[in-house]
Interface confidence: low
């Protein structure tokens, strides 16, 4: 059995792609025939699943280039949290204990987001046992996680969140130190094996993997809304809106935002990615009648998808003894 | 990308079929190929694959010592010779390759070959 | 080598119709399950693959769920097209098997 490959390097040229180089193993131990490049999905952070993106004044946006976090100013009022489905009007509130604790965590918060990718990639991972690599592997990858009881959190199980095991994908690369891997998830976290496999591979298997992580680069316009904006009337001077989420966005939409106005689009509203989860909306609240224009806008991992066309509703004033009642 | 396959034959018990399968559209050394057959208003039989970067095989045991997968880069084809025939191994033959999913699921498939034995 | 199971072998179903098909290995599989779709004289058609993901250009209307030995497809809402005969295979283990396969018929 040859030893492993040396010096794996991997790099994105597309949203879509990762090109890997490695050189030949020190010790082919006889005739070297090809190797084994197999790839696997990362999970994402289980804390970026959970926490309310719509709690904090400051929006973490990842610059690619150089993998720094910039802490984005909100210039505007701070966001508050759109009532989802038939929760009923939404009011400030004075602080409780638990988003006093959760402005405690905020460091922490930061430092998580700040992290993620930067563990991902170079918090030594456990070697997978040697296995015969035409047998697709069965590695688990635990999701990291933390408990917290901060308001700024959510313990609604996202389906995604559950996924944190992705099947290995494979290929095989004959004479030759290089390979581009194709059909990628865009800015999404993979983990690339090489094995050198040499004339007695069939009989013996291939080497230990020699691994390396890769991200792959955003996709220009995956982080847009792909539908229309509908809405629907609801009682108390309220409308739901309704949009289709991102097919395959930038690794992870974190929220959406909404800004609707009746002359201007003046206001915003923020919707967690749970929110929308669980309704596949928002509702707007204490609307005075008349007609509106609303534009939404998804967040992710890697930026902003662009604003919808507009879609135009109206709240229709209430008549007679109803609007004498009230 | 596409995977077509020789057309119908009709063989006697004993005798042998080499069936083949002609890829285009992708690069042929680097994708497994996987036999199927189906038996008359039956079920899928895996009947194993080949590797066309160096011709290496596996097959299913049923089939072992009957079967044999080769492959011609030249023409980016590979063939199933199936030996010894008998009645039962009347069937569509298909051949199928994982490209876009993990090796073992099949995402693209030839159109079949009919293989009929019969004396 | 892996059995694998399919049931029912045939059901009746009107368009707009929730159907589930099951499939059991006889050991533990690890998620390595995908289902086929084959209409008579075509070659089957790759809908799921490992247990849950939804092959390329398969309508969302085709979902899957399982673990351990237990397997399922369902399609939420049945169209005209979706009559034909449906395969599971287990992928964890050579030789790769498949199930006898359910025959999905208009009622």
């Known amino acids: 059995v040859p030893s492993i490959p040396l010096d794996v390097l991997s790099a994105s040229n597309s949203s879509s792609q990762l090109i890997v180089k490695w050189n030949p193993p020190s010790l082919p131990n006889g005739n070297l025939s090809y190797y084994i490049v197999r790839w696997q999905r990362q999970p994402q952070d289980g804390y970026l699943y959970r926490h309310n993106y719509c709690s904090k004044d400051k929006i973490p946006i990842r610059k690619y280039a150089d993998g720094t976090i910039d802490i984005e100013e909100v210039t505007e009022n701070p966001k508050t949290e759109v009532c989802g489905g038939e929760k009923g009007p939404c009011c400030a509130c004075p602080k409780t204990e638990a988003e006093k604790q959760a402005e405690k965590e905020e460091a922490e918060y930061r430092k998580v987001f700040e992290n993620f990718l930067h563990n991902s990639i170079f918090v030594p991972r456990p070697e997978r046992k040697r296995r015969d690599v035409m047998q697709v592997a069965n590695t688990t990858m635990s999701s990291r996680s933390r408990n917290t009881t901060a308001a700024d959190t959510y313990n609604i199980t996202d389906p995604e969140e559950l996924e944190t095991e992705y099947p290995f994908f494979e290929s095989r690369v004959d004479n030759k130190e290089r390979t581009v891997i194709s059909n990628l998830r865009p800015f999404t976290l993979y983990r690339i094996d090489i094995h050198s496999c040499n004339h007695e591979a069939e009989k013996l298997g291939c080497s230990a993997s020699n691994f390396v992580f890769a991200r792959t680069m955003p996709a220009e316009g995956a982080d847009d809304i792909p539908g229309p904006v509908t809405w629907e009337p609801r009682p108390e001077n309220s409308i739901f809106l309704k949009w289709p989420e991102p097919e395959n966005p930038n690794g992870l939409i974190l929220m959406y935002e909404i800004k609707y106005g009746s002359q201007v689009e003046d206001q915003r509203e923020c919707v967690s990615r749970q929110e929308y989860r669980k309704y596949g909306g928002a509702k707007l609240n204490r609307l005075n009648p008349g007609n509106y224009t609303a534009r939404i806008q998804a967040t992710s991992l890697s930026g902003n998808g662009s604003w919808t066309d507009p879609v135009f509703f109206y709240v229709q004033a209430k008549t007679g003894y109803e609007n004498f009642i009230h | 990308v596409q995977l077509v396959q020789s057309g119908a034959e009709v063989k006697k018990p004993g005798a042998s079929v080499k069936v083949s399968c002609k890829a285009s559209?992708?690069?042929?050394?680097?994708?497994?190929i996987h036999w199927v057959r189906q038996a008359p208003g039956q079920g899928l039989e895996w009947m194993g694959w080949i590797w066309p970067g160096d011709g290496s095989t596996k097959y299913a045991q049923k089939f072992q010592g009957r079967v044999t997968m080769t492959r011609d880069t030249s023409t980016s084809t590979v063939y199933m010779e199936l030996s010894s025939l008998r009645s039962e191994d009347t069937a569509v033959y298909f051949c199928a390759s994982p490209m876009i999913t993990p090796n073992y699921a099949m995402d693209y498939w030839g159109q079949g070959t009919l293989v009929t034995v019969s004396s | 080598d892996i059995q694998m199971t399919q049931s029912p072998s045939s059901l009746s179903a009107s368009v707009g119709d929730r159907v589930t098909i099951t499939c059991r290995a006889s050991?533990?599989?690890?998620?390595?399950l995908n289902w086929y779709q084959q209409k008579p004289g075509k070659a089957p058609k790759l809908l799921i693959y490992y247990t849950s993901r939804l092959q390329s250009g398969v309508p969302s209307r085709f979902s899957g769920r399982g673990s351990g030995t237990d397997y399922s497809l369902t399609i939420s809402s049945l169209q005209p097209e979706d009559f034909a005969t449906y395969f599971c295979q287990q992928g964890s283990t050579l030789p790769y098997t498949f199930g006898g396969g359910t025959k999905v018929e208009i009622k």
């Open positions: 559209g992708y690069t042929f050394t680097s994708y497994y």
């Open positions: 050991q533990d599989i690890s998620k390595y």
